[in-house]
């Protein structure tokens, strides 16, 4: 992957590092459920980062269907009334209250599968999702704090003599920027957007004439990216032997 600017050379590299994002489901198969039954039930609340535009499947506690009375999904999204989706086994009926987002649905009919799917995940899906399974032995809960991750767009340009600006635009959460080699950097600036994304900007200067190319490395939960740029000559500099 390479990108070029009109005034000097800029190259993009995307590392193959991805974090906890390959799987969009935390559901376990039956064998795992039996093996880890008590462990799973103990994991009442799960923090789960999910990348925007992917699909996510959220699961209920592993309770046998024959023991069920009611399955309820409670969905609390920022700035919206709480939405509930419930299924009563006895009457085989489903009910929804305050649920307007058509991207949040049962995976299939609740009598077949109690899992909830978000298809696809949007930035507005940040929130708390809880499955409550009512049985004769009591209620079993599993909750998800869903954190929607947004990959930042990375840009790099040389603004003036041996000063480069690297931006990680509209990422969620905020990205971290580092440089190779280290430069004389201004404090990192952060701009917060209404949708919860953050633009991070780092501006650095390199005095040493022996620095040829600078690399901006952006670290983010969705994966890391680097850009590099060959610095332009200082205006008026014609010939330099080794200046170091």
């Amino acid at each position: 992957e390479g990108a070029a600017q009109s005034n000097n050379s800029l190259m993009l590299q995307t590392s193959k590092e991805n974090h906890t994002l390959a799987s969009n489901s935390l559901c376990m198969d039956e064998k795992q459920i039996t093996q880890n039954h008590s462990k799973v039930l103990a994991e009442v609340n799960i923090s789960w980062p999910v990348q925007m535009a992917r699909n996510a499947v959220l699961c209920c506690p592993p309770i046998e269907f024959r023991n069920l009375i009611v399955i309820t999904w409670e969905i609390i999204l920022r700035g919206q009334p709480s939405c509930t989706k419930s299924y009563r086994k006895e009457t085989n009926e489903t009910k929804e209250t305050n649920c307007t987002d058509e991207r949040i649905t049962w995976v299939s009919t609740p009598d077949q599968n109690s899992d909830l799917q978000i298809h696809p995940v949007a930035i507005t899906h940040d929130g708390y999702y809880r499955c409550i399974m009512a049985t004769p032995d009591g209620n079993f809960h599993r909750g998800y704090h869903l954190q929607v991750l947004v990959t930042p767009e990375v840009t790099l340009f040389e603004s003036r003599n041996r000063t480069a600006v690297c931006k990680a635009v509209a990422g969620k959460p905020a990205a971290q920027i580092s440089w190779i080699p280290a430069g004389d950097c201004a404090p990192t600036e952060q701009e917060y957007w209404g949708n919860g994304t953050v633009t991070v900007k780092s501006t650095c200067h390199w005095e040493g004439h022996n620095v040829s190319t600078v690399t901006c490395h952006v670290s983010h939960l969705t994966g890391n990216k680097s850009l590099y740029i060959e610095l332009l000559p200082v205006p008026g500099a014609k010939k330099s032997a080794k200046l170091y």
């Epitope: 390479g2 070029a4 600017q5 009109s6 005034n7 000097n8 050379s9 190259m11 993009l12 590299q13 590392s15 193959k16 190779i180 080699p181 280290a182 004439h209 022996n210 620095v211 040829s212 190319t213 600078v214 690399t215 680097s226 590099y228 740029i229 060959e230 332009l232 000559p233 200082v234 205006p235 500099a237 014609k238 010939k239 330099s240 080794k242 170091y244």
Partner: antibody, heavy 114, light 107 residues
């Protein structure tokens, strides 16, 4: 796609000079540093220097400061390297490269022989 | 100058093997680099740019990674056509400097 065209070979006498050319296409010639590299037969690679066609700014490695002279002709999108006072030690393949080292010419084999 | 220390200088491996070579800058200087493959009589061919970016048309068995100030080129399953010399180029500091090369031979 960036392409750098170099002549295949040059045969020169000891003590003489040679001017190697590197014609660029497929990118904004004046916006990218052009670098030159030397490779002696069966040996490693050495960076000679670079030139910025947009301003004529040049850097040389100390070792090649009195051996190589880099110039450009922006109208023909061509970079040149003149090698002077040639000896057998200068017999090598010389490459030009641009786009932060990601695009290379095919190299010119310089043979210094009486 | 930043010296690039490349190891091993030569390597003999069998087809299908995983092959790894490394480059490190002297004094642990943080740098960025490219990896090249060169066959006799040919110009170097760029495999990996900027430490980890696989170039278009390069087989996916090649990969590059960075561990602090050390850089690794890995061939996941060696093929006949991979017999060549491999070298790194640091392009962060002037003068740009090359690793000494790793000559890869097939057993």
């Amino acid at each position: 796609q960036v392409q750098l065209q170099q002549p295949g070979s040059e045969l020169v006498r000891p003590g003489a000079s040679v001017k190697l050319s590197c014609k660029a296409s497929g990118h904004t010639f004046t916006s990218y540093w052009m670098h030159w590299v030397k490779q002696r037969p069966g040996q490693g690679l050495e960076w000679i220097g670079n030139i910025y066609p947009g301003s004529g700014s040049i850097n040389y490695d100390e070792k090649f400061k009195s051996k190589a002279k880099l110039t450009v002709d922006t109208s023909s999108r061509t970079a040149y390297m003149q090698l002077s006072s040639l000896t057998s030690e200068d017999s090598a393949v010389y490459y030009c490269l641009t786009m932060t080292g990601t695009s290379w010419g095919q190299g010119t084999l310089v043979t210094v022989s009486a | 100058d930043v010296q690039m220390i490349q190891s091993p200088s030569s390597l003999s491996a069998s087809l299908g093997d995983i092959v790894t070579m490394t480059c490190q800058a002297s004094q642990g200087t943080p740098i960025n680099l490219h990896w090249f493959q060169q066959k006799p009589g040919k110009a170097p061919k760029l495999l990996i740019s900027g430490a980890s970016n696989l170039e278009d048309g390069v087989p996916s068995r090649f990969s590059g990674s960075r561990y602090g100030t050390a850089f690794t080129l890995t061939i996941s399953s060696l093929e006949d056509e991979d017999m060549a010399t491999y070298f790194c180029l640091q392009f962060t500091y002037i003068p740009w400097t090359f690793g000494g090369g790793t000559k890869l031979e097939i057993k």
